[in-house]
Amino acid sequence: AIVFIKQPSSQDALQGRRALLRCEVEAPGPVHVYWLLDGAPVQDTERRFAQGSSLSFAAVDRLQDSGTFQCVARDDVTGEEARSANASFNIKWIEAGPVVLKHPASEAEIQPQTQVTLRCHIDGHPRPTYQWFRDGTPLSDGQSNHTVSSKERNLTLRPAGPEHSGLYSCCAHSAFGQACSSQNFTLSIADESFARVVLAPQDVVVARYEEAMFHCQFSAQPPPSLQWLFEDETPITNRSRPPHLRRATVFANGSLLLTQVRPRNAGIYRCIGQGQRGPPIILEATLHLAEIEDMPLFEPRVFTAGSEERVTCLPPKGLPEPSVWWEHAGVRLPTHGRVYQKGHELVLANIAESDAGVYTCHAANLAGQRRQDVNITVATVPSWLKKPQDSQLEEGKPGYLDCLTQATPKPTVVWYRNQMLISEDSRFEVFKNGTLRINSVEVYDGTWYRCMSSTPAGSIEAQARVQVLEKLKFTPPPQPQQCMEFDKEATVPCSATGREKPTIKWERADGSSLPEWVTDNAGTLHFARVTRDDAGNYTCIASNGPQGQIRAHVQLTVAVFITFKVEPERTTVYQGHTALLQCEAQGDPKPLIQWKGKDRILDPTKLGPRMHIFQNGSLVIHDVAPEDSGRYTCIAGNSCNIKHTEAPLYVVDKPVPEESEGPGSPPPYKMIQT
């Protein structure tokens, strides 16, 4: 038998909140449980769904969840079925609605001294209690001239008068919560003694020194008063005008006339109407002085024939909004055709060369007129005046390649060298007329050059080959001072190039012949065994037919190259003692010795009291410190060569003698002891 352990029970529920109808079943075999609502099976939704055997509500709905729920358990094998007790929800809710006119039938029928009934369309369960408001102020029950019926949710005004005019709203609250009217009702009951607007003043825009007129009329019974005020609350009357409104006139019908308007007259004017009863009515209107700003400049435009182009004219800022039109050759453009105006745009369709010229955009308003010209050029494809020619350019001199073209607008010329764009730098310059200048022609400038002349309409190009006429020059120029090692073999090379292979020779600078032990082999001066007499001035002469002769002068020095007689050794010194680094070099000319320590040259004039360099080249450092440690380099140099040798210096702490050590124990490394 199927037994319900837990049965659903009727319960209170809140609209839109969670709820659960419980159901638990015990049975010998498998059963399946489902729910009925008013006898119909309940389908699972996101809002309402089975949770085990129970039925869960994510948000109770007073419409969809009203009725009787029943839990049904069924054994599909035996067909046995059991039903739980019925359960239902007592759903509490409240729902906002509008304030509506119940009596009379329409607003048009509302007259002073008639009864007016308003209904509050807020509903709920349990029935809420109602509160009425006029212009946000609560209306208490039992006040004169109105009654509140909570049952009918009504507010009755008996009889209604002008004092009842206002915005009516209602709120209701119950155990569930509170709601206020979704739409309120404005009750307007005219009072003949209240001022009413007949004609309201409008904002006006006038040109300087023109006149401005504001109209203003009110009606009431008895007739209302009318007063004009300017911005600073100064009253304007025909008898008392403020100093800046000397030319103001107030007419009997309420209109205000201002003549010869000036900038100081611009501002807000208020027209105030006051009836016998009721509040004053204030109407505002602004007097603007007409103005028009300057128009932005147009950039000149370049168009190509056959295309369609548009030029937008941005109207200048102004009051009132300026009107805009285009003119060409003094004639206003039409609104259709091939060249026409569309809105603020100048449109040129299928452009022809004859369309070139000045077009003018005009803008005008009360304050005046502005105009701005735009120059329209119709581009043409460039044509040649002078193409670049194959040229022979001299090395080292400026070279020129022409690229003279004409077009509208002035064409842009770019040059390419070996298909690479030439960017202007210290060597290349492109003149305004398109000519390329190579400032100092190099041998490798001998190649193809191409110039391209362009306008927006198209481009033309031509190329030319440059042949460089190589100058007669030494390659490389011989060093003007050279050293040869005494008693050794030596060679002094000299080579040159030119348009034609030059012939090269050496001679003594005085023009005398070379001694027979010195040979000149196609420009290489060869000394089999250098003697002291070989020192002196020599001239290398390179010569060819087309270019003549060039000379390079060389001073040869005979030297005994540097060797070290004494080199510094690896040295370890106790802190506070003196270090001696010896260095002696020989050579001719006699070498000078410099020392480098810790990667900087030791300047003998700035050594300080602890360091000294002896005439023989040795370096002495007194009172050595740990920071003196490092590599020391002895550099020997003369006008012919330079040699260096280095050794490390270590500065160590003096060990504290142990008892067992005798006074004569030697240190564990080579020391300088002072």
Epitope: T503, A509, A522, G548, Q549, R551
Partner: antibody, heavy 114, light 107 residues
């Protein structure tokens, strides 16, 4: 067209001086070493003196050293030969030329005779 | 001084014949040798410079060569207008020296 035009020749007594000039045109004068070469009547050619393109180095044959002076003015493109202590053996046609790649003048006759 | 020994002193050759004139330098002069042609009553004219380079306007039948310190001028097909005296000049070392000349005649 290259042109070298000598002037200043003529008859001169032994021991006296004479100056020859050579006006150059049609080429870059300052690029070339210049020389004077002479030819005694019915004899061969004899180099006399030369000067480097910038004028800094001069060369003379031993027989004229100390008597003749070669000079040039690159701005005016002229070559000069100042001859002193003239001897009868200096009698010859004197040619101005670009040394090495010779363009020659038409020559000017110098006669040293008492 | 460098001596230039020119040979032969004179020679007669037939038209269209090959003619060779030599100059022997007393020491190495590299390629600093030129050849000149002089016609009676005229200034000498440059034929070849730098041992082998033909001067502008000189017919290609003229050529120059060198073997050590011996230099040669060759006329491949003798023409009537080639008669005259031919000189070599060494411009390697001052004093610059001319050869003694070779007088060329037509047979």
């Amino acid at each position: 067209e290259v042109q070298l035009v000598e002037s200043g020749g003529g008859l001169v007594q032994p021991g006296r001086s004479m100056k020859l000039s050579c006006a150059a045109s049609g080429f870059t004068f300052s690029n070339y070493d210049m020389a004077w070469v002479r030819q005694a009547p019915t004899k061969g050619l004899e180099w006399v003196t030369s000067v480097s393109s910038d004028g800094s180095t001069t060369y003379y044959r031993d027989s004229v050293k100390g008597r003749f002076t070669i000079s040039r003015d690159n701005a005016k493109t002229t070559l000069s030969l100042q001859m002193g202590s003239l001897r009868s053996e200096d009698t010859a046609t004197y040619y101005c030329l670009t040394l090495y790649y010779s363009h020659w003048g038409q020559g000017v006759m110098v006669t040293v005779s008492s | 001084d460098i001596q230039m020994t020119q040979s032969p002193a004179s020679l007669s050759a037939s038209l269209e014949e090959i003619v060779t004139i030599t100059c022997q330098a007393s020491q190495d002069i590299g390629d600093w040798l030129s050849w000149y042609q002089q016609k009676p009553g005229k200034s000498p004219q440059l034929l070849i410079y730098g041992t082998t380079t033909l001067a502008d306007g000189v017919p290609s039948r003229f050529s120059g060569s060198r073997s050590g310190t011996q230099f040669s001028l060759k006329i491949s097909r003798l023409q009537v207008e080639d008669i005259g005296i031919y000189y070599c000049l060494q411009a390697y070392s001052a004093p610059f020296t001319f050869g003694s000349g070779t007088k060329l005649k037509i047979k």
